[in-house]
């Protein structure tokens, strides 16, 4: 039950931090202009990783994407990759994940296999979210460096009484949202982590005894095969009750402690 | 045909109070951010408040800040400026504009006559 | 505050020649998000509200005649009317339309010489 809860509430966090990397790589404000000399403007600028926009006071905004892929500054170049693997290792890692859940039966699966797709994706998860950190902190550091760099060019263009004043920027909301959802992203892979070591089965191995209906002579075969997931897939071992022959099929009446409800 | 038209301008005396209508018509009203600009007798313009769409972006020249107050009530097409504490230098025509791209007034209204005289 | 300064304040040219009204600003109204001039011409005739003629620094507001154009970037600007005729006869303001307040020029007075 608490592997379950543990798998489940993993799945969750992770996707809900996936649905916030995704959010917050299409989202316009990574940098946002900074408003401490101006704090009045009637224009606001404000940069995502794919567009410039400009909101006006009249509630016009404009916004340009950036057409040119050489023209884009490396670090740009390389947080858009890191947000875009995050995505798709999270997506890939979700898609897994479905199927590794202990609440979804899906044909005759095992649960070692469970087990190790539950690992996969939270090996994933985890991937994702330090992308997803990684970018949102490379973004972030371009930001403080270009801020502390114009800062120190701010009035180097005042000549008498015209003032050139160098527009800074500052973190924009989406920085806060990438990096949230990439540790939901990541305690979401821990989970799934944590969730594979409950789901790894017990190697316990279970005599089948085999009695045939004259009752003359008993075989004793050392066990080995665990017990069916109750999908019938067994059928070449045959195990005899009570004196009656009948195959594995018709025995798994009831469901025992290692089928999927 | 886009209108705005003001009302509530008078002779008013120092230190007194006056609260200036604009009644709104021809264009969706919440849709944009209003203004109101003044011109004292045989001077320039001078821009006195902004009010956007929803209201919850208000600016104010220095000059009145914290004398006057931009209102609006969207149901009723309708902008205001409640002005206290009247000065002399306060006399001047008031105009009321529609705010629009650009950050620019692209209808005006005919303006009402506000008089702080004693 | 952005302090905006119109020369000359007056002017008087003759029909259909060329008048040439200059504003500079304290500081940039060029915003580098959009590489727009946050620059806004005015024309207002006697016992008439303001009309706007220019935004952005050179765009042309709907209706206007194209005799009228607007030019400059970051702190000087221009409007020009290519050919005067009677009806311009006005004072023209320029606006800073970039931060608040949005201060206006002292305004420049066009007549026929």
């Known amino acids: 039950m608490a592997v379950t809860a543990c798998q489940g509430l993993g799945f969750v966090v992770s996707l809900i931090g996936i649905a916030g990397i995704i959010a917050a790589t299409c989202m316009d404000q990574w940098s946002t202009q900074d408003l401490y000399n101006n704090p009045v403007t009637a224009v606001f600028n404000y940069q995502g990783l794919w567009r410039s926009c400009v909101r006006e006071s009249s509630g016009f905004t404009e916004c340009r994407g950036y057409f040119t892929l050489l023209g884009l500054p490396a670090m740009l170049q390389a947080v858009r990759a890191l947000m875009i693997v995050g995505i798709v290792l999270g997506a890939i890692g979700l898609l897994v994940s479905i199927f590794a859940l202990k609440c979804i039966r899906i044909g005759s699966m095992e649960d070692s296999a469970k087990a190790n797709m539950t690992l996969t994706s939270g090996i994933m998860f985890i991937v994702s979210g330090l992308c997803a950190i990684a970018g949102v902190s490379v973004f972030a550091n371009m930001l403080v460096t270009n801020f502390w760099m114009s800062t120190a060019n701010m009035y180097t263009g005042m000549g008498g009484m015209v003032q050139t004043v160098q527009t800074r920027y500052t973190f924009g909301a989406a920085l806060f949202v990438g990096w949230v959802a990439g540790g939901l992203t990541l305690i979401g892979g821990v989970m799934m982590c944590i969730a594979c070591r409950g789901l790894a089965p017990e190697e316990t191995n279970y005599k089948a005894v085999s009695y045939h209906a004259s009752g003359h002579s008993v075989a004793y075969k050392p066990g080995g095969f665990k017990a069916s997931t109750g999908f019938g897939s067994n059928t070449k071992n045959k195990k005899i009750y009570d004196g009656g022959a009948r195959t594995e099929d018709e025995v798994q009446s009831y469901p025992s402690k290692h089928d999927y409800v | 045909e886009v209108q705005l038209v003001e009302s509530g301008g008078g002779l008013v005396q120092p230190g007194g109070s006056l609260r200036l209508s604009c009644a709104a018509s021809?264009?969706?009203?919440?849709?944009?951010?209003m203004a109101w600009v003044r011109q004292a007798p045989g001077k320039g313009l001078e821009w006195v408040a902004f009010?956007?769409?929803?209201?919850?972006?208000?600016y104010y020249v220095d000059t009145v800040t914290g004398r006057f107050t931009i209102s609006r009530d969207n149901a009723k097409n309708s902008l205001y400026l409640q002005m206290n504490s009247l000065r002399a230098e306060d006399t001047a025509v008031y105009y009321c504009?529609?705010?629009?791209?650009?950050?620019?007034?692209?209808?005006w209204g005919q303006g009402t006559l506000v008089t702080v005289s004693s | 505050d952005i302090v905006m300064t119109q020369s000359p304040d007056s002017l008087a040219v003759s029909l259909g020649e060329r008048a040439t009204i200059n504003c500079k600003s304290s500081?940039?109204?060029?915003?580098?998000?959009?590489?727009?001039?946050?620059l806004t011409w005015y024309q207002q005739k006697p016992g008439q509200p303001p009309k706007l003629l220019i935004y952005?620094?050179?765009t042309r507001e709907s209706g206007v005649p194209d005799r009228f154009s607007g030019s400059g970037s970051g702190t000087d600007f221009t409007l020009t009317i290519s050919s005067l005729q009677a009806e311009d006869v006005a004072v023209y303001y320029c606006?800073?339309?970039?931060?608040?307040?949005?201060?206006f020029g002292g305004g420049t007075k066009v007549e026929i010489k």
């Open positions: 504009a529609r705010f629009t791209t650009g950050n620019v007034m692209d209808y």
């Open positions: 021809g264009f969706t009203f919440s849709d944009y951010g």
């Open positions: 009010i956007n769409n929803l209201a919850y972006s208000i």
């Open positions: 500081q940039s109204l060029l915003q580098g998000g959009n590489q727009k001039n946050y």
């Open positions: 952005w620094s050179s």
């Open positions: 606006q800073n339309s970039y931060s608040y307040p949005l201060t």
